[in-house]
C-alpha cells in the first residue's frame, strides 16, 4: 500500500510541479521594474522570456515580442533551452509514469516493467526540475548582476544639468513559481524513484522452493512476505491465492500459513 | 463616446470645504483630476488607480484633497479641505488613457477661495 | 519631480507660417521597456479645456490635422505647425506622462502678428 501511495503522490507532486513550469515559462513576469523609491510608477515595466510590457497607470498594457532569435543575449536563450528541455522530460516523464501507475492495469505488464518505468520517470522528473530550477537560477543570476550594474550607473548626469534614469529591474513572480515547481518536480521523481525501489523485483542467490498444501498452490521463496517481487522473471514466482491476479499489495495482506521454511 | 460633467464648484472660504462631482459616462480608463488657476497653466492634482481605488497625488494636495470615486454612480469626486486663496482655479476631471494622455475632459469648474 | 520647460513662452506668427516650440525636460522620458517617450502635447483656447494633440511624443491624436508633428527623445522634444492656420492661435502645453507627479510645461501662446 506504501509503494502505491508513494508512487501516485509522486505522479501527482510532479504533475504539479510540471504544470508550474509550464506556467512560469509562459509567464511575462520573470524580472519587473524595480520601484525602489517609487512605489507608485506611471509606466511600469515587466519582461518574460518572450516579450517584454509595459502597464502604463492608464491600465493600458501594451507587449512586444522578441521577434528576433540571433540579437537576444546568449543567456535568456540558455534559460529558454533549459525550461524547455524541463518541460519536454518533464512531459515524457508523466507520460511514463501514468502506464507505470500500480493503480492501472495495462495487459499483463510485469511489475518489473512497471518499476523500470517508474524509475525512469523518476529520473525524468529529477532532471525536469533541475532544469527548471538551474534555469530560474541563471536568469536570477542575470538580474541580480545586471541590477547593481544600473545601480552603479543609476544616474547618469549630461552636463551636470539633465539626469537619465536607469530601469532596474528585479525579480518577478515567473521566478519563485519556477523555483516551486521545479522543486516540487524535484521532490516527485525522488518520490517516484523510491516507490521504484518497493517495486523492483530483489536480484537473490537462493532458489525458489514450492511447497505444495491441500488445496493451496503456493510459491515460497525466502524473504519474507516480499516473495511476490520474483526472480529476475517474474513470472514464476509469483503468488497465486484463489487463482486470481492481486496486486503485490493484496498479496503481502494475506500471508499464508504455508510461508514458512 | 466618453462624457465627462463637472459640478460643485463655487465660492467657498479660506479655510472652508468643497466636494467637486464628475459624472462619467461611456468607457472610462483611471480618472485624474486637473486645475488651471486664472491665466496660469495647466496642474495635474490626483489619479485614482482604476483597478485598485488607490489614489495618488501631487505633493502639493496630499492631505489637504481626497480623490475619490463610485462605481455605482459612475461618479468621480474630489473632496478639498483647509482651501486657501491659491486653489483658485478652474477645476477640470480628465481621463487617463493610453500614453498616459489626458485624453477626454469635462468643461471645469471654477472653484473661489475668498473672504 | 520631473521639471518642464518650454520655450518660447509666447510667439507672434502669421497664417502660414512654419512653428516650432521645445520643450525641455529635467530627467528622460524615454521608456527603455518599450522605446517610447512618454511626452504629450495639448492645445488649449481660452475658456475651453485643453485638447490632446500628440502623445508617445510624435503619435499624432486621431482627428488632429496632419500639419501638427512632434519630434525628440529623452529630454529634448519639439511641436512643429507646419503651416499655422486661424485656429491654430491658441496655448500649447507639454507634459510629462512619464512618472507622477505628471507635470506640465508653463505654455506656449501662439498669437497672430
Known amino acids: 500500500m506504501a509503494v502505491t501511495a508513494c508512487q501516485g503522490l509522486g505522479f501527482v507532486v510532479s504533475l504539479i510541479g510540471i504544470a508550474g513550469i509550464i506556467a512560469a515559462t509562459c509567464m511575462d513576469q520573470w524580472s519587473t521594474q524595480d520601484l525602489y523609491n517609487n512605489p507608485v510608477t506611471a509606466v511600469f515595466n515587466y519582461q518574460g522570456l518572450w516579450r517584454s510590457c509595459v502597464r502604463e497607470s492608464s491600465g493600458f498594457t501594451e507587449c512586444r515580442g522578441y521577434f528576433t532569435l540571433l540579437g537576444l543575449p546568449a543567456m535568456l536563450q540558455a534559460v529558454r533551452a533549459l525550461m524547455i528541455v524541463g518541460i519536454v522530460l518533464g512531459a515524457i516523464g508523466l507520460l511514463v509514469s501514468i502506464f507505470a501507475l500500480k493503480c492501472i492495469r495495462i495487459g499483463s505488464m510485469e511489475d518489473s516493467a512497471k518499476a523500470n518505468m517508474t524509475l525512469t520517470s523518476g529520473i525524468m522528473f529529477i532532471v525536469s526540475g533541475l532544469c527548471a530550477i538551474a534555469g530560474v537560477s541563471v536568469f536570477a543570476n542575470m538580474l541580480v548582476t545586471n541590477f547593481w550594474m544600473s545601480t552603479a550607473n543609476m544616474y547618469t548626469g549630461m552636463g551636470g544639468m539633465v539626469q537619465t534614469v536607469q530601469t532596474r529591474y528585479t525579480f518577478g513572480a515567473a521566478l519563485f513559481v519556477g523555483w516551486v515547481a521545479g522543486g516540487l518536480t524535484l521532490i516527485g521523481g525522488v518520490m517516484m524513484c523510491i516507490a521504484c525501489r518497493g517495486l523492483a523485483p530483489e536480484e537473490t542467490n537462493y532458489k525458489a522452493v514450492s511447497y505444495h498444501a491441500s488445496g493451496h498452490s503456493v510459491a515460497y521463496k525466502p524473504g519474507g512476505f516480499k516473495a511476490s517481487t520474483g526472480f529476475g522473471s517474474n513470472t514464476k514466482n509469483k503468488k497465486i491465492y484463489d487463482g486470481g491476479a492481486r496486486t503485490e499489495d493484496e498479496v503481502q495482506s494475506y500471508p499464508s500459513k504455508h510461508d514458512y521454511v | 463616446e466618453v462624457q465627462l460633467v463637472e459640478s460643485g464648484g463655487g465660492l467657498v472660504q479660506p479655510g472652508g470645504s468643497l466636494r467637486l462631482s464628475c459624472a462619467v459616462s461611456?468607457?472610462?480608463?483611471?480618472m485624474n483630476w486637473v486645475r488651471q488657476a486664472p491665466g496660469k497653466g495647466l496642474e495635474w492634482v490626483a489619479w485614482?488607480?482604476?483597478?485598485?481605488?488607490?489614489?495618488t497625488y501631487a505633493d502639493d494636495f496630499k492631505g489637504r484633497f481626497t480623490i475619490s470615486r463610485d462605481d455605482s454612480k459612475n461618479t468621480l469626486y474630489l473632496q478639498m479641505n483647509s482651501l486657501r486663496a491659491e486653489d483658485t482655479a478652474v477645476y477640470y476631471c480628465?481621463?487617463?488613457?493610453?500614453?498616459?494622455?489626458?485624453?477626454?475632459w469635462g468643461q471645469g469648474t471654477l472653484v473661489t477661495v475668498s473672504s | 519631480d520631473i521639471q518642464m520647460t518650454q520655450s518660447p513662452s509666447s510667439l507672434s506668427a502669421s497664417v502660414g507660417d512654419r512653428v516650432t516650440i521645445t520643450c525641455k525636460s529635467s530627467q528622460s522620458l524615454l521608456n527603455s521597456g518599450n522605446q517610447k517617450s512618454y511626452l504629450t502635447w495639448y492645445q488649449q483656447k481660452p475658456g475651453k479645456a485643453p485638447k490632446l494633440l500628440i502623445y508617445?511624443?510624435?503619435t499624432l491624436e486621431s482627428g488632429v490635422p496632419s500639419r501638427f508633428s512632434g519630434s525628440g527623445s529623452g529630454t529634448d522634444y519639439t511641436l512643429t505647425i507646419s503651416s499655422l492656420q486661424p485656429e491654430d492661435f491658441a496655448t500649447y502645453y507639454c507634459q510629462n506622462a512619464y512618472s507622477f507627479p505628471f507635470t506640465f510645461g508653463q505654455g506656449t501662446k501662439v498669437e497672430i502678428k
Open positions: 485614482i488607480n482604476m483597478y485598485t481605488g488607490e489614489p
Open positions: 480628465a481621463r487617463l488613457g493610453p500614453g498616459n494622455v489626458f485624453d477626454y
Open positions: 461611456g468607457y472610462t480608463f483611471s
Open positions: 508617445w511624443a510624435s
